[in-house]
Structure formats: C-alpha cells, structure tokens
Amino acid sequence: QKSSIEKCSVDIQQSRNKTTERPGLLNCPIYWQQLREKCLLFSHTVNPWNNSLADCSTKESSLLLIRDKDELIHTQNLIRDKAILFWIGLNFSLSEKNWKWINGSFLNSNDLEIRGDAKENSCISISQTSVYSEYCSTEIRWICQKELTPVRNKVYPDS
C-alpha cells in the first residue's frame, strides 16, 4: 500500500518518463544557479513537500537529488542563511521502510547524516549545515534541479 506522497512521486516520475526527449540543456535558464553539471532553482516561497514536488515538475525539473556528501556540501554553500530549510527529493517510503529518492533509488546510509526520525510522512530538508527529517506537511522552501547535458555535435547528411 503506497502512501499518497509515494503515489504522487511515482506519478510525476512516470509522466516525465513518457514525455518526448528534449534537446540537451547547455546553459542554466535565468534565475537558475549552476552547480557543476546541474542547474538549481532555490524557491523564495514555501510549500509542503508534495506541492514542492509538483512545482518542480511544472518547471520540467525535479526536486533536488543529491549524489554524495560532496554535492551536499556544495549545495549547502549556496544557502545564504542558517534559518532557511529547503525540501529535497527524498522522503520516507512506508512500504519499504527506507528513505527513497524520487527517482526510485534508496538512500545510501553513508551519503547523508539525517537528523530526526525515519517514519511515515517524513521528508528530507537541508539547511546551511545539516540534513533534517521534517513532517512532509511543513511549509518550507524547496530546490528544483535540471541536469545539464553535454550535447554531442550531430552530423547531418548532405542535403
């Protein structure tokens, strides 16, 4: 039995997979910040986790996925104040009793040191210094990401 948050996450991911391939993103759009091979958008408003997830989807992006501790630190360095929390694309899967990224993969326990409980209706936020489990209904800011894709030169046949 999937929770409503899990269903929402899966639905958005599936609809993204169904869309046709878009051309590779060479540069970050206006207002987005480049962090290595990603473009990040830090929201200025607040939302529960579900709405944040949906907002990123409408921007043809996803809630932030963090690969490792190094990426976490570099992202945290972009947060301007200690009293700001941002949702990322990680929440507790009740069915699998584990932290699950919105791309379907599970959290490697070495990647993030989460402060707080792993339980139903828990979603992950990050601050300047830490990673927190917060209730998914809490209204805080969020971070969307777009992948920058290296575009190979296409060779066209002579016309």
Epitope: D81, E134, T138
Partner: antibody
Framework: EVQLVESGGGLVQPGGSLRLSCAAS????????MSWVRQAPGKGLEWVSA????????YYADSVKGRFTISRDNSKNTLYLQMNSLRAEDTAVYYC????????????WGQGTLVTVSS | DIQMTQSPSSLSASVGDRVTITCRAS??????LNWYQQKPGKAPRFLIY???SLQSGVPSRFSGSGSGTDFTLTISSLQPEDFATYYC?????????FGQGTKVEIK
C-alpha cells in the same frame, strides 16, 4: 481556533534558571516552526529563539546563545524554553509565536508570561 | 545584523486621519517585511506580510508598500481601535529583527 498559552514565568534571582512552556492547540503543531520573542518592560520586541517543526533544527539570538535552550514535544503540542544563568537584562514578557524559519512571519502569538530576574 | 528603523517614534492623530509609518532596513531585504500591531498589555497582532499582503481578517484600511530598504504602513482612515504601537520586522536573514516601534496616540 489557534491558541498559544504560555506558563512558567516568575521571579528568579540572577544566575538562576526557569523553564517556560507554551501549550498549542487548533493547528497541526508538528508542521510549524515555533519561536520565543520577548519584550522588556516599556521596550520593543526582541526575537529570542526558533525551532523547526520536527525539533531537529534550532537557532538563537546571540544575547541568549549558550544560556537558553528551545525544545518541543510534538506528542504534547508543547514548546519549551529552558533559561539558565539568568541576568537582569533577561527581565521581560516572553511570548511564544508560530513561525520563525525564513521567510515565516509570526502569525499567532500567546498572551505572554512575565519573567523577572532580580535579587 | 540588519537594523530596522521606524519613523516617527510616535505620532498624534484623530479618528478618520490618514496615517503613514515608515520603516527602513540597514540593507536590502527584498520584500521580506512584516507589520504587527500591539496594544498595551496585549500580545502583538500580525497585520501584513511580504511588505504588502494583508493577513486574513485584517481590515482593508491597513495597507503596506515598499521593497528593498524602504517600507510604509498606511492606515487610510484611523479608527478608535487603531490607537496602538506598530512594529515592522524583517524575515530576510537571522537574527530576525524588529523596528523600535511607532506609537499612534489620540490627538
């Protein structure tokens, strides 16, 4: 209806301790950051401390850092402020307020509890 | 820390008057400014958020404007229940700071 009710204030000697409580009702307590804000007699408002909805994240004004500790018990819908090493300048009405993480405003306030630090 | 400076510190006005209170931040705070009303012996009441958005239940005679460093609270037609002290507050960065207050008194 949102309600915040503070208790625990009183007269305490300099160097003493006190614990304030704030009982919350009328909203999903665990989904909101909470703060303590104080007001010295005849003076303006001063933010003291804030805590995230889960209680995992806290922060403090420099004037109370290392002396005051904010905490919460979401099972009891209660916010706390443990005040140690109290000074005369801590004398104030202490309000609990909903909000405190940027860009939250303090949208609901308790009625306040008076803390007097005097020998 | 961001300093918030209100002016005037106090003012005298009559019922029906248009009243304007200004709040200046020591650095740009975008639109992260809130206004509160406080009556003697009472807790503050939240009036306006994000510089110009009226909190639910607050009468429409209250309005806010401004962005960056300069902000204004306007009461279009002062009512007897509006005599109080008004505070601005920034939620751009920590520590959260308030203005020193503006006391609106009866002329």
């Amino acid at each position: 209806e949102v309600q915040l009710v503070e208790s625990g204030g009183g007269l305490v000697q300099p160097g003493g301790s006190l614990r304030l409580s704030c009982a919350a009702s009328g909203f999903t307590f665990s989904s909101y950051a909470m703060s303590w804000v104080r007001q010295a007699p005849g003076k303006g408002l001063e933010w003291v401390s804030a805590i995230s909805g889960s209680g995992g994240s806290t922060y403090y004004a420099d004037s109370v850092k290392g002396r005051f500790t904010i905490s919460r018990d979401n099972s009891k819908n209660t916010l706390y402020l443990q005040m140690n090493s109290l000074r005369a300048e801590d004398t104030a009405v202490y309000y609990c307020a909903r909000g405190g993480y940027l860009p939250d405003a303090f949208d609901y306030w308790g009625q306040g509890t008076l803390v007097t630090v005097s020998s | 820390d961001i300093q918030m400076t209100q002016s005037p510190s106090s003012l005298s006005a009559s019922v029906g008057d248009r009243v304007t209170i200004t709040c200046r931040a020591s650095q740009s705070i975008s639109s992260y400014l809130n206004w509160y009303q406080q009556k003697p012996g009472k807790a503050p009441r939240f009036l306006i958020y994000a510089a110009s958005s009226l909190q639910s239940g607050v009468p429409s005679r209250f309005s806010g404007s401004g962005s960056g460093t300069d902000f204004t609270l306007t009461i279009s037609s002062l009512q007897p229940e509006d005599f109080a002290t008004y505070y601005c507050q920034q939620t751009y960065s920590t520590p959260l700071t308030f203005g020193q207050g503006t006391k609106v008194e009866i002329k």
